[in-house]
């Protein structure tokens, strides 16, 4: 029985041309996590796997580092990063877990002076 | 350099049984997952089983499930495929390759012919 | 289990030719889509893994790109030794499935 939980940032933003760390947490199970894999909607972005470590896809190289922890970083973002990430835990013996982060990368000046978009 | 060598192939009679081993040399075999993907004569590829790095976990096509026994002894840095109850129509060459990250097969053996016949 | 479905199965090209083979998925299997060569009594070579990622040593004549259910393989500029025959793997969930292959042949 599955009994665990992933725990994420949940929704976040970010500025256009920053950075931001994409973080998942397994907790309530005593499975042995094999493997991480972010993935970005249809994309593989990264895996950490417990033996064999860190494999960042060749198209992110640029763009993503690994860590911390178990935790992703994207660097020099876009607008066009904005989107849904999950992390997917692959863990011994229960299965798969998955978590969703939602991120927003705003323009600089929306990130600045984002209350003008409140409605009065 | 990353080298499997398949052994153990052969004639056998329908209803008998064969043991093939995968020897591998030039990674930590321990730390990979393996797998055993056949090819019938003129035909394409079938992925028959898959074990992880510790042997803790296998897998098999449906078509073999119940038959054939994936494992691995990572101290002879060997891969095994035990086949049962065999059949004609898994003559095949049988190859066995490593597989990265749970997914892609990055190296494969040469192969090695299964033949079931009376 | 995830069928896919490789079109063509076979064609004609010459040396020099832009080659497309397309691979598609009964479902969605997000980037996990690998791409082997295989020449007559010669093991399989990967080429592409995670639908887009070059393989270490692969001439970066072939390319991939994809997701979901939709792939494609292209070789830019066809060269005498690319004559094989190419297959697609979903690496999604178990059982891992191939397409039927496709044969590339001089025209």
């Known amino acids: 029985m599955m009994t665990g939980t992933i725990e994420t940032t949940g929704n976040i933003s970010a500025e256009k041309g920053g950075s931001i760390i994409l973080q998942c947490h397994l907790s309530s199970t005593t499975a042995q996590v094999t493997q991480v894999n972010w993935e970005q909607q249809d994309q593989l972005l990264a895996i950490c796997n417990a033996d064999l470590g860190w494999h960042i896809s060749p198209s992110f190289k640029d763009r993503v580092a690994p860590g911390p922890g178990l935790g992703l970083t994207l660097q020099s973002l876009t607008v066009n990063d904005t989107g849904e990430y999950f992390c997917i835990y692959h863990t011994y013996p229960d299965g798969t877990y998955t978590g969703r982060i939602f991120l927003e990368v705003l323009e600089s000046s929306v990130a600045e002076h984002g209350a003008r978009f409140q409605i009065p | 350099e990353v080298q499997l060598l398949e052994s153990g192939g052969g004639l056998v009679q329908p209803g008998g049984s064969l043991r093939l081993s995968c020897a591998a040399s030039g990674f930590t075999f321990s730390s990979y997952a393996m797998s055993w993907v056949r090819q019938a004569p003129g035909k394409g590829l079938e992925w028959v089983s898959a074990?992880?790095?510790?042997?803790?976990?296998?897998y098999y096509a449906d078509s073999v499930k119940g038959r054939f026994t994936i494992s691995r002894d990572n101290s002879k840095n060997t891969l095994y495929l035990q086949m049962n109850s065999l059949r004609a129509e898994d003559t095949a060459v049988y190859y066995c390759a490593r597989v990265p990250y749970g997914y892609w097969m990055d190296y494969w053996g040469q192969g090695t012919l299964v033949t079931v016949s009376s | 289990d995830i069928q896919m479905t490789q079109s063509p199965s076979s064609l004609s090209a010459s040396v020099g030719d832009r080659v497309t083979i397309t691979c598609r998925a009964s479902q969605s299997i997000s980037s996990y889509l690998n791409w082997y060569q295989q020449k007559p009594g010669k093991a399989p070579k990967l080429l592409i893994y995670a639908a887009s990622s070059l393989q270490s040593g692969v001439p970066s004549r072939f390319s991939g790109s994809g997701s979901g259910t939709d792939f494609t393989l292209t070789i830019s500029s066809l060269q005498p030794e690319d004559f094989a025959t190419y297959y697609c793997q979903q690496s999604y969930s178990t059982p891992l499935t191939f397409g039927g292959g496709t044969k590339v042949e001089i025209k």
């Open positions: 074990i992880s790095g510790s042997g803790g976990s296998t």
